[in-house]
Interface confidence: medium
Amino acid sequence: DFTPTAPLASYPQPWLGAHPAAVVTPGINVTLTCRAPQSAWRFALFKSGLVTPLLLRDVSVELAEFFLEEVTPAQGGSYHCRYRKTDWGPGVWSQPSNVLELLVTDQLPRPSLVALPGPVVAPGANVSLRCAGRIPGMSFALYRVGVATPLQYIDSVQPWADFLLIGTHTPGTYCCYYHTPSAPYVLSQRSQPLVISFEGSGSLDYTQGN
């Protein structure tokens, strides 16, 4: 019943995006935008786990907006959309769009912070600290305990960021966190602290330096 009567290439997939963001705090109004590569007659929004379309929009342009008002954590999940044209056969829809993960939360999960290759380094050597969350496209900040402002900021496409610490000022205790790159900002918990020390320095704590 649902097999298109022409090759799937005839029904190219749309693109689904979220505004203001795909990660938001509860109570925010979120707009999911389904954009087709050609003018469409009808758009359908689907949520993973539900076999019914969540919403339909009848339009005669390339995009449809689906409004989710004052979202709650329960509205988080995986969304995708499809579109169809009047001249397609009955029941023929486009291929599904990209999957959009909507996360509605007051606080993002705590990231991990690890040293590469390890937390004990040769004096004067560089060390890379990887702050890893579970969500791509976040802004990451690295802190040194005892220093109020972040040492480094990185906007990352991946769900992690690698901070390079150079040379003699490396030893100390570090932590990191991440947040959404734009408003409305959602922040993670801080990572567990990570102690970086020079080889042979024992458990000497350098956190008061600089």
């Epitope: 019943d1 649902f2 009808r42 359908a44 949520k47 539900l50 076999v51 019914t52 379309p53 969540l54 919403l55 339909l56 329960a74 499809r82 009955p90 029941g91 023929v92 829809w93």
Partner: antibody, heavy 118, light 109 residues
Framework: EVQLLESGGGLVQPGGSLRLSCAAS????????WTWVRQAPGKGLEWVSG???????NYAQNFQGRFTISRDNSKNTLYLQMNSLRAEDTAVYYC????????????WGQGTLVTVSS | QSVLTQPPSASGTPGQRVTISCSGS????????VSWYQQLPGTAPKLLIY???NRPSGVPNRFSGSKSGTSASLAISGLRSEDEADYYC?????????FGGGTKLTVLG
């Protein structure tokens, strides 16, 4: 006007087969999830099967294998093929259309009575 | 035996407020929407509440729905004789729709 009209019910012997139809009018049939729900005499509602906009049909456990749901989008019609019928399948069978907020059934047909008896 | 549990009967006098409960689990009500249906004698069910607390157009605001955790309830205020009917809750669980066993509401006097 939105309307659902079931047909195909009647008296059938145990072990027999029956095919129910549900003709829809007043909206774009192919855009919706369609379902069959039944109600045995004096009993409650029981979901039987559903036909999604995309993908495979789904069934309540009791009906998997014996019942087959299908749809003809060009005819705006939903079907239920019922095989190996038993006395306990005696019920009014309703077809219904699902809404868009996660699984309510907003429009129902008037129902068709299936009686399985020798 | 229904997965969603409703009291088999409820009653009230005209003008009263009556509440019907529906109890499920985290895999159905806890994680999905709840709907309520009214079935008058000899007729097909009619959607009364969807998405936990929304009323379709044409349903009087005397009917209201709510959900908390793994339970839901339907409240009918200003009870009328025409409200005498069977009421069913419904939710969703891994590609299956579930109905409660139904509650027969009797309007006394």
């Amino acid at each position: 006007e939105v309307q659902l009209l079931e047909s195909g019910g009647g008296l059938v012997q145990p072990g027999g087969s029956l095919r129910l139809s549900c003709a829809a009018s007043g909206f774009t049939f192919s855009d919706y999830y369609w379902t069959w729900v039944r109600q045995a005499p004096g009993k409650g509602l029981e979901w039987v099967s559903g036909s999604p906009v995309f993908g495979a049909a789904n069934y309540a456990q009791n009906f998997q294998g014996r019942f087959t749901i299908s749809r003809d989008n060009s005819k705006n019609t939903l079907y239920l093929q019922m095989n190996s019928l038993r006395a306990e399948d005696t019920a009014v069978y309703y077809c219904a259309k699902a809404g868009f907020t996660g699984g309510h059934f907003d429009i129902w047909g008037q129902g068709t009575l299936v009686t399985v008896s020798s | 035996q229904s997965v969603l549990t409703q009291p088999p009967s409820a009653s009230g006098t005209p003008g009263q407020r009556v509440t019907i409960s529906c109890s499920g689990s985290s895999s159905n009500i806890g994680n999905n929407y709840v709907s309520w249906y009214q079935q008058l004698p000899g007729t097909a069910p009619k959607l009364l509440i969807y998405g936990n607390s929304n009323r379709p157009s044409g349903v009087p605001n005397r009917f209201s729905g709510s959900k908390s955790g793994t339970s839901a309830s339907l409240a009918i205020s200003g009870l009328r004789s025409e409200d005498e009917a069977d009421y069913y809750c419904q939710s969703y669980d891994s590609s299956s729709w579930l109905f409660g066993g139904g509650t027969k509401l009797t309007v006394l006097g």
